[in-house]
Interface confidence: medium
C-alpha cells in the first residue's frame, strides 16, 4: 500500500510512512515542502479554496483546526480556523496551537513529560481506541498494541501525535500520517499562510520544536515572496 | 522531474528467487519512503512492504515477512525488492512507489 | 478477500453517475485513516483520483469527487465519458494488520 498526506496540531490522521519525506533527523530539510502533487509527470499544484472547507481537522493546516464559522451555527459549513494560543478556550487537543494542548477547556503549553503520558490517556476522538501504532523499523512479528501500548518510532503510522514518541509528530506522508521527528534549530520548515495557497500538504512536515519558531531565514529577506525559505529558529 | 524507473520483466523457475530494481531522480531519494506493490495477472494490487531509504528501515507486510527483502542503495537512488522461494502464484507486475509516483511497473513470470 | 470491499463492477451510460463504493471496518476507514482512489488502466501504474478522502489532484476532473461515512468511503463519477472505463481501487491503512491495504477493485464499464 502506497505512501500519504496531511497535516495538524496533534497533527491528525494518517498511516505509516507510504510516499512523503522521511524526515530524518539529520537532514537539513526534513521533509519536502508538499502543496505540490505530481500529477503526470509534472508537479500541479493542488486545487485551492478560500475558506478553505472541511470535515475534520485533518484536512487543514498545522495551525488550524475545522469547526463551524460562527457559534451555534450549521455544523454542516466547516472551514478551517486559526488555531488557539496559549490561555485561550478549547475544547479538543487540535483546536490549540502546535505544541500546546488542550487542558480543562483551555490551550496549554505542552512540555514534554507531561504532554506525552497525559494526551494519550484523554484524547477521544471519535476513532475510538482501538488503533495501534507500527514500530518504523524492521520487524517480522507484530505485537497487539493493546497489550504493548509502545508509542510509534519514526516511520510508524500514527492518527495522532499523541501515538508518537518523544520528539515526533504525526505528519501526512500522501498515504498515511507517519511519526516524523519534530525539527530542530535551522531545519526547514512550513509556513502556513492564512489566506490564499490552501490545500493539503502531500508530504507535512512536524512544527519546529520547544523554544523555536518558524520564521523566514534572514539571508532571505530580500528574496521574493514566493521563494523565501523559513527555518526553525530561536525566538 | 521525480521518476522511478524499474528494471525489465523476469522469468524464473519455482523455488528460485527474483530481484527487482527501482533507480529513482528528479528528487531527495533519502527524504522517502518506497513501497512495493504487486498485482497478479487479472487481480487487484496487493502492498507488500516498504523501505525508509535514508536508514534502511522496512516493514513488511505479514504475507511476505518470510520471503521477502527490501534494501537500497542511497549512492545510486535504488531500491530493491527480492521474493525468495518463488511459486506460480507470485507470478504479478510488481510495482514500487513513493505514494504520489508509481515505477512502471516489472513483470516477474514464475513458471517451470 | 480483500480488507476493504468493493463491488466487482459497475455500469453506466455516457453522461450518467455511478458511484463506487468501499466497505472497510472499524481498524481501518472506521479508525481514521485515509481513503485514497486510484484509476488504473489496462497495462498501466494505478493513478491517483482522490486522497484524503475527498480531495482531488490538480489534473483530475471535478466530476470525480469521494466522500467518506463510518467505516465506508465512496466515489463518484458524473458526466461518465467512455475513456471512464477502467478499474478503480480504494486503499487505506489497517491498524489491525499493520498494513497499507486495497479494496478488491471495481471495473467500470461505460455503456
Known amino acids: 500500500t502506497l505512501n500519504s498526506v496531511l497535516n495538524s496540531n496533534a497533527i491528525k490522521n494518517l498511516p505509516p510512512p507510504l510516499g512523503g519525506a522521511a524526515g530524518h533527523p539529520g537532514s537539513a530539510v526534513s521533509a519536502a515542502p508538499g502543496i505540490l502533487y505530481p500529477g503526470g509527470n509534472k508537479y500541479q499544484t493542488i486545487d485551492n479554496y478560500q475558506p478553505y472547507p472541511c470535515a475534520e481537522d485533518e484536512e487543514c493546516g498545522t495551525d488550524e483546526y475545522c469547526a463551524s464559522p460562527t457559534r451555534g451555527g450549521d455544523a454542516g459549513v466547516q472551514i478551517c480556523l486559526a488555531c488557539r494560543k496559549r490561555r485561550k478556550r478549547c475544547m479538543r487537543h487540535a483546536m490549540c496551537c502546535p505544541g500546546n494542548y488542550c487542558k480543562n477547556g483551555i490551550c496549554v503549553s505542552s512540555d514534554q513529560n507531561h504532554f506525552r503520558g497525559e494526551i494519550e490517556e484523554t484524547i477521544t476522538e471519535s476513532f475510538g481506541n482501538d488503533h495501534s501504532t507500527l514500530d518504523g523499523y524492521s520487524r517480522r512479528t507484530t505485537l497487539s498494541s493493546k497489550m504493548y501500548h509502545t508509542k510509534g518510532q519514526e516511520g510508524s503510522v500514527c492518527l495522532r501525535s499523541s501515538d508518537c514518541a518523544s520528539g515526533l509528530c504525526c505528519a501526512r506522508h500522501f498515504w498515511s500520517k507517519i511519526c516524523k521527528p519534530v525539527l530542530k534549530e535551522g531545519q526547514v520548515c512550513t509556513k502556513h499562510r492564512r489566506k490564499g495557497s490552501h490545500g493539503l500538504e502531500i508530504f507535512q512536515r512536524c512544527y519546529c520544536g520547544e523554544g523555536l519558531s518558524c520564521r523566514i531565514q534572514k539571508d532571505h529577506h530580500q528574496a521574493s515572496n514566493s521563494s523565501r525559505l523559513h527555518t526553525c529558529q530561536r525566538h | 522531474e521525480v521518476q522511478l524507473v524499474q528494471s525489465g520483466a523476469e522469468v524464473k523457475k519455482p523455488g528460485a528467487s527474483v530481484k527487482v530494481s527501482c533507480k529513482a531522480s528528479g528528487y531527495t531519494f533519502t527524504d522517502y519512503y518506497i513501497h512495493w506493490v504487486r498485482q497478479a495477472p487479472g487481480q487487484g494490487l496487493e502492498w507488500m512492504g516498504w523501505?525508509?531509504?535514508?536508514?534502511?528501515?522496512?516493514t513488511y507486510a505479514q504475507k511476505f515477512q518470510a520471503r521477502v527483502t527490501m534494501s537500497r542503495d542511497t549512492s545510486s537512488s535504488t531500491a530493491y525488492m527480492e521474493l525468495s522461494r518463488l511459486e506460480s502464484d507470485d507470478t504479478a507486475m510488481y510495482f514500487c512507489?513513493?505514494?504520489?509516483?508509481w515505477g512502471q511497473g516489472t513483470l516477474v513470470t514464475v513458471s517451470s | 478477500q480483500s480488507v476493504l470491499t468493493q463491488p466487482p463492477s459497475v455500469s453506466g451510460a455516457p453522461g450518467q453517475r455511478v458511484t463506487i463504493s468501499c466497505t472497510g471496518s472499524?481498524?481501518?476507514?472506521?479508525?481514521?485513516?485515509?481513503v485514497h482512489w486510484y484509476q488504473q488502466l489496462p497495462g498501466t501504474a494505478p493513478k491517483l483520483l482522490i486522497y484524503?478522502?475527498?480531495n482531488r489532484p490538480s489534473g483530475v476532473p471535478d466530476r470525480f469527487s469521494g466522500s467518506k461515512s463510518g467505516a465506508s468511503a465512496s466515489l463518484a463519477i458524473t458526466g461518465l465519458r467512455p475513456d471512464d472505463e477502467a478499474d478503480y481501487y480504494c486503499q487505506s491503512y489497517d491498524n489491525s494488520l499493520s498494513s497499507y491495504v486495497f479494496g478488491g477493485g471495481t471495473q467500470l464499464t461505460v455503456l
Open positions: 523501505i525508509h531509504s535514508n536508514s534502511g528501515a522496512t
Open positions: 472499524s481498524s481501518n476507514i472506521g479508525a481514521g485513516y485515509d
Open positions: 484524503g478522502y475527498s
Open positions: 512507489s513513493r505514494e504520489d509516483y
